[in-house]
């Protein structure tokens, strides 16, 4: 019998330096394109190999981006969020929410990380 699946949610501040093709990740979400039901937040859909985010190593696919340079990403249209990233400057501070899946099974079963949330 499988155990209950819980999520450990943590927040982190990540500072990235823009590379030749941006910050090195793709986003989904927004008020006009909800990626998660009843949540119009902005999520990381892909980390580009050798891009700024991949080289930093902390941002993960499935992370929710809460703010960019202190600007809240709540209730934004998808394109407005994209424009924020495009115009964020050379040094960019991201506040992100990681969601780690942990399975509470029988004793002896280890938790499993699922960065895609």
């Amino acid at each position: 019998m499988n155990g209950r699946v819980d999520y450990l949610v943590t927040e982190e501040e990540i500072n990235l330096t823009r590379g030749p093709s941006g910050l090195g990740f793709n986003i989904v979400g927004g008020t006009d394109q909800q990626y998660v039901s009843n949540d119009s937040g902005i999520y990381v859909s892909r980390i580009k190999e050798n891009g700024a985010a991949a080289l930093d190593g902390r941002l993960q696919e499935g992370d929710k981006i809460l703010s960019v340079n202190g600007q809240d990403l709540k209730n934004l249209l998808h394109q407005d969020a994209v424009d924020l990233f495009r115009n964020a400057g050379y040094a960019v501070s991201l506040r992100v929410q990681h969601r780690l899946q942990v399975q509470n099974g029988p004793i002896g079963h280890r938790g499993e990380g699922d960065p895609s949330g």
């Epitope: 030749p20 093709s21 941006g22 910050l23 990740f25 793709n26 986003i27 989904v28 927004g30 006009d32 394109q33 859909s45 892909r46 580009k48 190999e49 891009g51 998808h78 394109q79 994209v82 424009d83 990233f85 495009r86």
Partner: nanobody
Framework: EVQLVESGGGLVQPGGSLRLSCAAS????????IGWFRQAPGKEREGVSC???????YYADSVKGRFTISRDNVKNTLYLQMNSLKPEDTALYYC????????????????????WGQGTQVTVS
């Protein structure tokens, strides 16, 4: 350096077919939401078809059922198969990529993309 180079345009009769190619260099194509755009003389640029990194596709109503977008990740090339061409498809066709958006509809409707090719001319006459 990020570069997109289109090819495959030409003169074709109504009802004919063409296959456009967009070769990418300086980046890995499947890391980007990317699409095909066109601009006819005196008209605004429009998004024709776009594809997300996960393969979701969008087509403008005017080309649905006639055009097919695809991507070859080994060749790092984007394609647009154009069938049943009409005179109103005459335009300069560009490919363009977004560094951030992974929403194919938004990419095709955006006027603020990050990498553009020079275009290839398609004339249906």
């Amino acid at each position: 350096e990020v570069q997109l180079v289109e090819s495959g345009g030409g003169l074709v009769q109504p009802g004919g077919s063409l296959r456009l190619s967009c070769a990418a260099s300086g980046f890995t194509l499947d890391d980007y939401a990317i699409g095909w755009f066109r601009q006819a003389p005196g008209k605004e640029r429009e998004g024709v078809s776009c594809i997300s990194t996960h393969g979701s596709t969008y087509y403008a109503d005017s080309v649905k059922g006639r055009f097919t977008i695809s991507r070859d990740n080994v060749k790092n090339t984007l394609y647009l198969q154009m069938n049943s061409l009409k005179p109103e498809d005459t335009a300069l066709y560009y490919c363009a990529a977004s560094y951030y958006s992974d929403y194919e509809v938004a990419v095709c409707r955006s006027d603020a993309l990050d990498a553009w090719g020079q275009g290839t001319q398609v004339t249906v006459s």
